[in-house]
Interface confidence: low
């Protein structure tokens, strides 16, 4: 018969004959022949292969670098890579989440819109008329500024974004 | 100019204490997040702990989780690591950076204070 130009699904072409791919979590050893069926072996302990292949060599499973500020979110497996993900209060810098960055915090002035995730920073906002934010954090929102009137004090002195109204006792008029 | 620097180092038997102190200036302490990190003799850096500017949210490296404090006086422009039942694998030297990574992307460094671990 004429050699084979293609094969099928999880097979591979090699010196003209078909032979079956290794399956996921398997490394290739040696192609088939006339007589043997291709050999295959388990990816060892750190190692994995994720698809139909004929790698000689698996790959390394990712290493979660706790320097980077990263831990291990799912531990890979033969067939799977490992996941990293940052530690709690840091965040991926890119969507492969190869490092991580500190939660960042909102200036005086600006209040916290959304609390950081581990994939995404703090989203902050500025302060409006009324509220106010005298700290740097990664979790307060602007405060509304206090109510003088219902205290029976009046306003001595007005509050901005980044400060508190003050508030003192109403002038008593003499009779 | 930004200054940072470390104090409270010295030699301390295992299971033992000790506080070290980071002395900041030249920026607003009170908008930075501030880090620890180590370096052991021979080895390389290693991120150790990390604190929000306003102190609310505190960060540690797993092998020093559960013995190490890490806190900061914005009124004082201080940070500290309070470090309790040392091990020998804790010798190193200790460095106070401002910045939010952990790696060695800090915008400053201080010069760091010696911690050693030894009976």
């Known amino acids: 018969p004429e050699p084979p130009t293609a094969c099928r699904e999880k097979q591979y072409l090699i010196n003209s004959q078909c032979c079956s791919l290794c399956q996921p979590g398997q490394k290739l050893v040696s192609d088939c022949t006339e007589f043997t069926e291709t050999e295959c072996l388990p990816c060892g302990e750190s190692e994995f292969l994720d698809t139909w292949n004929r790698e000689t060599h698996c790959h390394q499973h990712k290493y979660c670098d706790p320097n980077l500020g990263l831990r291990v979110q799912q531990k890979g497996t033969s067939e799977t890579d490992t996941i990293c993900t940052c530690e709690e209060g840091w965040h991926c810098t890119s969507e492969a989440c190869e490092s991580c960055v500190l939660h960042r915090s909102c200036s005086p002035g600006f209040g916290v819109k959304q609390i950081a995730t581990g994939v995404s920073d703090t989203i902050c906002e500025p302060c409006p008329v009324g509220f106010f934010s005298n700290v740097s954090s990664a979790f307060e929102k602007c405060h509304p500024w206090t109510s003088c009137e219902t205290k029976d004090l009046v306003v001595q002195q007005a509050g901005t974004n980044k400060t508190d109204v003050v508030c003192g006792p109403q002038d008593r008029l003499r009779a | 100019e930004v200054q940072l620097l470390e104090s409270g180092g010295g030699l301390v038997q295992p299971g033992g204490s000790l506080r070290l102190s980071c002395a900041a200036s030249?920026?607003?302490?009170?908008?930075?997040?501030m880090t620890w990190v180590r370096q052991a003799p021979g080895k390389g850096l290693e991120w150790v702990s990390a604190i929000q500017p306003m102190g609310d949210g505190t960060y540690y490296a797993d092998s020093v989780k559960g013995r190490f404090t890490v806190s900061r006086d914005n009124s004082k422009n201080t940070l500290y690591l309070q470090m309790n039942s040392l091990r020998a694998e804790d010798t190193a030297v200790y460095y106070c950076?401002?910045?939010?990574?952990?790696?060695?992307?800090?915008?400053?460094w201080g010069q760091g204070t010696l911690v050693t671990v030894s009976s």
């Open positions: 030249g920026f607003t302490f009170g908008d930075a997040a």
């Open positions: 950076a401002k910045g939010r990574i952990p790696t060695l992307q800090f915008d400053y």
